[in-house]
């Protein structure tokens, strides 16, 4: 596949990764739908560093991440180990909360007004960020 | 100038097979997520397939999904949509379709003159 | 899937009047909205996105109006051209989804 060495129009370049930061809301299905499509995924955050750069970006605006548990466990969209990676939860969150009175409990991280995460129903309209990985090779079709 | 022409439509029985092609030209084909859409006769358009530039992900509409698959050809600027298990329902004038190239931005800047698939014993 | 109606389904007016169409969705869209203008046998052409922005070389007597779940386009005053079908799609939601089209005929 190509390579992409430089980010495109209108993303911002950080730490070897092309990042894209939404002015409008959507699901986080939808959100992660318009990633995939320009070959990017949901923000996957992975150090205290990426945080505040995402956090710096975003403002005190509820915005969605590409983490989630809509399968059971807590998964990062690009395979990173939950377990052990980044988090930055706020206190008593996750906690799948099922008093919104929308059905189901929670399963869809979001940055929060002070950047730490919590989780909440997936089909809020909540702005999103996309990521992108410079220097790696693009991916290609799977072969049928 | 943005040129998109599709091919490879025609009459097929129910549950056969078809390969469209759409050969693109006058943009950079490799940094545009594209798309095919459909018109029945006498009806409305309605999405069928994406796939972002490179490829490597790709969306389907339910009525389709499991017997289309949408591929792209970047070397050779050609956006493709192999369809099987056909049933008289897919009868319509398929569009191949570039997307507007922003985020978030699901519209449609540029359209083929499409290739009208007919499924009929 | 997010629902698009269109009304009406024709519009009849003579040329050089105002002609205005509708598009509602069964749930907010919020200003994910595009129109189209499709002439018998042609591919459709994009007019307007993101509700009211007029898409490039699209004259200034097309406008486009609305969020949420109520759009209006608005064709100030009619060309031979603008007999055709108008198609209003979404793009908040996948899938995208497009209303089934008005026909503006020749009074």
């Known amino acids: 596949g190509s390579e992409r060495t430089c980010c495109p129009v209108n993303w911002v370049e950080h730490e070897r990764s092309c990042y894209w930061f939404s002015r409008s809301g959507k699901a986080w299905a939808d959100a992660d739908n318009y990633c995939r499509l320009e070959d990017a995924h949901l923000v996957v955050v992975t150090s205290w560093e990426e945080q505040k750069f995402v956090q710096h970006h975003i403002g005190p605006v509820n915005t969605w991440m590409g983490l989630h548990d809509q399968n059971g466990p807590w998964k990062w969209v690009d395979g990173t180990d939950y377990e052990t990676g980044f988090k930055n939860w706020r206190p008593e969150q996750p906690d799948d909360w099922y008093g919104h009175g929308l059905g189901g409990g929670e399963d869809c991280a979001h940055f929060t007004d002070d950047g730490r995460w919590n989780d909440d129903v997936c089909q809020r309209p909540y702005r999103w960020v996309c990521e992108t990985e410079l220097d790696k090779a693009s991916q290609e079709p799977p072969l049928l | 100038e943005v040129q998109l022409l599709e091919s490879g439509g025609g009459l097929v029985q129910p549950g056969g097979s078809l390969r469209l092609s759409c050969a693109a030209s006058g943009f950079t084909f490799s940094s545009y997520a594209m798309s095919w859409v459909r018109q029945a006769p006498g009806k409305g358009l309605e999405w069928v397939s994406a796939i972002s530039g490179s490829g490597g992900n790709t969306f389907y509409a339910d009525s389709v999904k499991g017997r289309f698959t949408i591929s792209r050809d970047n070397s050779k600027n050609t956006l493709f949509l192999q369809m099987n298990s056909l049933r008289a329902e897919d009868t319509a004038v398929y569009y191949c379709?570039?997307?507007?190239?922003?985020?978030?931005?699901?519209?449609?800047?540029?359209w083929g003159q499409g290739t009208l698939v007919t499924v009929s014993s | 899937e997010i629902v698009m109606t269109q009304s009406p389904a024709t519009l009849s007016v003579s040329p050089g009047e105002r002609a205005t169409l509708s598009c509602r969705a069964s749930?907010?869209?919020?200003?994910?909205l595009a129109w189209y203008r499709q002439k018998p046998g042609q591919a459709p052409r994009l007019l307007i996105y993101g509700a009211s922005t007029r898409a490039t070389g699209i004259p200034a007597r097309f406008s486009g109006s609305g969020s949420g779940t109520e759009f209006t386009l608005t064709i100030s005053s009619l060309q031979s051209e603008d007999f055709a079908v108008y198609c209003c799609q979404q793009y908040n939601n996948w899938p995208f989804t497009f209303g089934p089209g008005t026909k503006i005929d020749i009074k």
């Open positions: 749930q907010s869209v919020s200003s994910s």
């Open positions: 379709a570039k997307f507007f190239g922003i985020v978030g931005a699901g519209y449609f800047d540029y």
